[in-house]
């Protein structure tokens, strides 16, 4: 015989769930024991069956989960999973906060990415910091020239997608450019999007030729000697 224990504690590390109103929330407390334990749920310390909740709840005992769809502010609270068998019991608390902020287009931190100057052969990092209520995704674009033109017949710039990523809100997204060459010079755009829309911010990368070893602070004219 064995008292209940968590089988996947790493899946329970996110204690605070702050979600926009209308979203679906799923709490899981995967457990095991001998005999096989049972699970029940409490809300703010009281037995919770969801009878007073519009849309009710879904309890999936085989998945050790509680699912609430279309959460509203009254769903805020502490949700406790209580797992027990004849030998013992364990419990875990989740905190649910329902956000009523107006979700907006992603906001990109001013000044990022920043105009940057680098020397051929060096490494460059372009930064983009995104603020978004909804889960944002990011693209790094490089503006390119096709047939001598930067813009298509439709008036939009030609771009090459360098990187696409889903990120957490307020995370800094970095574009690494290794061993830059003159061809890497140009305009780079950080595009951030969410369910409301897209936002853009651009910066220029200037790439200078490799420094001449004869060029020193003491003898700037040396560069031009024969």
């Amino acid at each position: 015989q064995q008292a209940p224990y968590w089988t996947h504690p790493q899946r329970m590390e996110k204690k605070l769930h702050a979600v926009p109103a209308g979203n679906t929330v799923k709490f899981r407390c995967p457990a095991a024991g001998n005999p096989t334990p049972t699970i029940r749920w409490l809300k703010d310390g009281q037995a919770f069956h969801g009878e007073n909740r519009i849309g009710g709840i879904r309890l999936r005992h085989q998945h050790w989960s509680l699912v609430m769809e279309s959460v509203v502010p009254s769903d805020r609270g502490t949700y406790t999973c209580l797992v027990e068998n004849a030998v013992g019991s364990i419990r875990y608390n989740y905190l649910l906060d329902v956000l009523e902020r107006s979700p907006h287009r992603p906001i990109l931190q001013a000044g990022l990415p920043a105009n940057t100057t680098a020397v051929v052969g060096s490494d460059v990092e372009l930064l983009c910091k995104v603020y978004s209520d909804a889960q944002p995704h990011i693209q790094w674009l490089k503006h390119i020239v096709i047939n001598g033109s930067s813009f298509g017949a439709d008036g939009f710039p030609y771009v090459q997608v360098l990187k696409t990523a889903d990120i957490n809100s307020s995370e800094v997204e970095v574009l690494y450019l290794r061993n830059v060459s003159a061809e890497d010079a140009g305009e780079y755009t950080c595009l951030a999007g969410n369910s409301i829309g897209l936002s853009y911010q651009s910066a220029w990368l200037t790439v200078l030729p490799e420094e001449d070893p004869t060029w020193t602070a003491a003898a700037p004219e040396a560069r031009y000697t024969d």
Partner: antibody
Framework: EVQLLESGGGVVQPGRSLRLSCAAS????????MHWVRQAPGKGLEWVAV????????YYADSVKGRFTISRDNSKNTLSLQMNSLRVEDTAIYYC?????????????????WGQGTMVTVSS | DIVMTQTPLSLSVTPGQPASISCKSS???????????VYWYVQKSGQPPQLLIY???NRFSGVPDRFSGSGSRTDFTLKISRVEAEDVGVYYC?????????FGGGTKVEIK
């Protein structure tokens, strides 16, 4: 051709439920957020809900919060709106609208493609 | 929520003459990325709305150049330089900066 086609409208009594669907074609549905917008007879336009490209984020107008649920099935290129506890004031044409894409677009980032709409009448 | 207030309620225009519709938002629609997220639509009888102008002043593909959008922050204008019979319909402005997305009440354009 990019197209959105709504279905599922009809006449229903107050308090009952209805499920609307929107079939998308001509674009990569799974790369776009999708919206529902409604228009009461002879009235203006009212935004109802949005769902992100992967279904992970959903937002609703206060007037439908807790009663309507937006969902999507990217494998079937289908957007849905489950409408519960319907009220007389939910009577409207419901339009499915394409939202922002997952990345760079040469043009507007959404609200460019609308379906023809499906009529929902809530009446006792 | 951002309130979009449209004027006038209706407009009767002689073909070939200009027309102007105003839209005011309760908050600035100028985003941190420098773009102003106001859209303009026309809805013709029995049809869904059709996009005319996006991001304040960009004409959507296929929209005649007699349509133009202008303004800044909270005050926006849709202009039709020379109204044609096919321009009859209800015109709406919309803010596309945050949810809930909101529309103006509409301006009905008729031909004299």
């Amino acid at each position: 051709e990019v197209q959105l086609l709504e279905s599922g409208g009809g006449v229903v009594q107050p308090g009952r439920s209805l499920r609307l669907s929107c079939a998308a074609s001509g674009f990569t549905f799974s790369s776009y957020a999708m919206h529902w917008v409604r228009q009461a007879p002879g009235k203006g336009l009212e935004w109802v809900a949005v769902i992100s490209y992967d279904g992970s984020n959903k937002y609703y107008a206060d007037s439908v919060k807790g009663r309507f649920t937006i969902s999507r099935d990217n494998s079937k290129n289908t957007l849905s709106l489950q409408m519960n506890s319907l009220r007389v004031e939910d009577t409207a044409i419901y339009y499915c609208v394409r939202g922002a894409g997952r990345g760079y677009t040469r043009g507007p980032d959404g609200f460019d493609i609308w379906g023809q709409g499906t009529m929902v009448t809530v009446s006792s | 929520d951002i309130v979009m207030t449209q004027t006038p309620l209706s407009l009767s225009v002689t073909p070939g003459q200009p027309a102007s519709i105003s839209c005011k938002s309760s908050r600035s629609l100028l985003h941190s990325d420098g773009k102003t997220y106001v859209y303009w639509y026309v809805q013709k009888s029995g049809q869904p709305p059709q996009l005319l102008i996006y991001e304040l002043s960009n004409r959507f593909s296929g929209v005649p150049d007699r349509f133009s959008g202008s303004g800044s922050r909270t005050d926006f204008t849709l202009k039709i330089s020379r109204v044609e019979a096919e321009d009859v319909g209800v015109y709406y402005c919309m803010q596309y900066i945050e949810a809930p997305l909101t529309f103006g009440g509409g301006t009905k354009v008729e031909i004299k």
